[in-house]
Interface confidence: medium
């Protein structure tokens, strides 16, 4: 996901609508003049604010990356959502890209979760249930896995 | 790695006033969006407020808009929060939060990378 914090734009274009602050803040969808005296919409498509706020420009919108699928677009009050595309996923942790799902388990253990765009397979062992701990394996250990992605043996 | 240490929390009256900091330490966070979350007994984490990047500008959840307000000082790398007019559904541990990156808002929980221990905050008569 590709995404700068704040987006410099040009202000005070004609078509940009204004309202008022409401305590020194301006609406979802809208971002403060250096003034202070206005609210001025965010551009839709462009960028967007999601909260009350006092921003000098709104957020610029994230374009979601190759590998990556659109969910909704951006609006005004509400950023892109990109998902993993099938047979990737991406973790809470390191967000940064999808990452291929493996396409089987180390041998003696079994698929208890499929894929999802937010996790990938997840393996338990065969007798214990104990999950997978993301280790990198033995060679001989690996059942099957996506090319570049060695299975993980469990904890 | 960044470690935040929240303080200022405490038992307050209604009506009364707070004021939290986040010391940080191990990041300079003058290019990063800090913000606040909290939890209240029994609910989910919510979204407080959030200081976008070097003093660009700031957010607010809707609840707390013209009560609260968020502030930084990047040469103390510290976050502050001052609380007025509390009520007693203010009442939660306040967590300090960083982003994972730079260019990341912070508005929900996904965007955080680095949470401090909490502070409780007590609104009661």
């Known amino acids: 996901i590709t995404q700068q914090d704040l987006a410099p734009q040009q202000r005070a274009a004609p078509q940009q609508k204004r309202s008022s602050p409401s305590e020194g803040l301006c609406p979802p969808g809208h971002h403060i003049s250096e003034d202070g005296r206005d609210c001025i919409s965010c551009k839709y498509g462009q960028d967007y604010s999601t909260h009350w706020n006092d921003l000098l420009f709104c957020l610029r919108c994230t374009r979601c990356d190759s590998g990556e699928v659109e969910l909704s677009p951006c609006t005004t009050t509400r950023n892109t959502v990109c998902q993993c595309e099938e047979g990737t996923f991406r973790e809470e942790d390191s967000p940064e890209m999808c990452r291929k799902c493996r396409t089987g388990c180390p041998r003696g253990m079994v698929k208890v979760g499929d894929c999802t765009p937010w996790s990938d397979i997840e393996c338990v062992h065969k007798e214990s249930g104990t999950k997978h701990s993301g280790e990198v394996p033995a060679v001989e250990e690996t059942v099957t896995s996506s090319p570049g992605t060695p299975a993980s043996p469990c904890s | 790695e960044v470690q935040l240490l929240e303080s200022g929390g405490g038992l307050v009256q209604p009506g009364g006033s707070l004021r939290l900091s986040c010391a940080a330490s191990?990041?300079?966070?003058?290019?990063?969006?800090m913000g606040w979350f909290r939890q209240a007994p029994g609910k989910e984490r919510e979204f407080v407020s959030a200081s976008v990047w070097n003093n660009g500008g700031n957010y607010y959840a809707d609840s707390v808009k013209g009560r609260f307000t968020i502030s930084r000082d990047n040469s103390k790398n510290t976050l502050y929060l001052q609380m007025n007019s509390l009520r007693a559904e203010d009442t939660a541990v306040y967590y300090c939060?960083?982003?994972?990156?730079?260019?990341?808002?912070?508005?929900?929980?996904?965007?955080?990378?680095?949470w401090g221990q909490g502070t409780l905050v007590t609104v009661s008569s």
């Open positions: 191990g990041r300079s966070i003058s290019n990063y969006a």
């Open positions: 939060v960083v982003a994972r990156t730079p260019e990341t808002p912070i508005t929900s929980a996904r965007g955080a990378n680095y």
